[in-house]
């Protein structure tokens, strides 16, 4: 089970619930976006394949002072089995292009919705 205690309940959260909550948070970010998200900050795009959650966290954790994505950063840390620090990039994370945080969130959301529909909760 993905352990995400503290988000919806005090104990371990089923992976399907954790993924649904992450999707809901990303939807919330995209719908409530008035000004450019995180002041137009640019982050490394990621491969939406194996190790996606850690890669997404490695990318977004570098953005500081952006309250809009703080909850997403915390949620992603629950999906990633190792501790991630700013400036840390795993060998799986190929740095080839930077995109705005808003585009990053949209791309991630589309992919997570697809995974949810297909029942891939881990």
């Amino acid at each position: 089970l993905t352990c995400l205690g503290g988000f919806a309940s005090p104990g371990p959260v089923p992976p399907s619930t954790a993924l649904r909550e992450l999707i809901e948070e990303l939807v919330n970010i995209t719908q409530n976006q008035k000004a450019p998200l995180c002041n137009g900050s640019m982050v490394w795009s990621i491969n939406l394949t194996a190790g996606m959650y850690c890669a997404a966290l490695e990318s977004l954790i570098n953005v500081s002072g952006c309250s809009a994505i703080e909850k997403t950063q915390r949620m992603l840390s629950g999906f990633c089995p190792h501790k991630v620090s700013a400036g840390q990039f795993s060998s799986l994370h190929v740095r080839d292009t930077k995109i705005e945080v808003a585009q990053f969130v949209k791309d991630l959301l589309l992919h997570l919705k697809k995974l949810f529909r297909e029942g891939q909760f881990n």
Partner: nanobody, 116 residues
Framework: EVQLLESGGGLVQPGGSLRLSCAAS????????MDWVRQAPGKGLEWVST????????WYADSVKGRFTISRDNSKNTLYLQMNSLRAKDTAVYYC?????????WGQGTLVTVSS
């Protein structure tokens, strides 16, 4: 207070060259990853290039790879972008940016116009 001041833009013919500079102050420059970002008229932001704090690692957008070179002089707190073989599609306002901070820490930009 973080300040970034770009310079070096101008009008250049296709195939020509320009060197952009960005003077940084108000933060520990040699600890920060730095970006060049551009915005073409009526378009969104486009990432151009990134350089690591030491300057040893560099990354480029496919659209500029092999033509642009990013560099930095940490002793002068200055970031550079050498632009060669310029094309009309490179016309844009170029901004230097402290990575991951967004435009609250950008300078006013420098306009590069590539036209014959």
């Amino acid at each position: 207070e973080v300040q970034l001041l770009e310079s070096g833009g101008g009008l250049v013919q296709p195939g020509g060259s320009l060197r952009l500079s960005c003077a940084a102050s108000g933060f520990t420059f040699d600890r920060e990853e730095m970006d060049w970002v551009r915005q073409a008229p009526g378009k969104g932001l486009e990432w151009v290039s990134t350089i690591s704090p030491s300057g040893r690692k560099t990354w480029y957008a496919d659209s500029v790879k092999g033509r642009f070179t990013i560099s930095r002089d940490n002793s002068k707190n200055t970031l550079y972008l050498q632009m060669n073989s310029l094309r009309a599609k490179d016309t844009a306002v170029y901004y230097c940016a402290k990575a991951y901070t967004g435009f609250r820490y950008w300078g006013q930009g420098t306009l590069v116009t590539v036209s014959s």
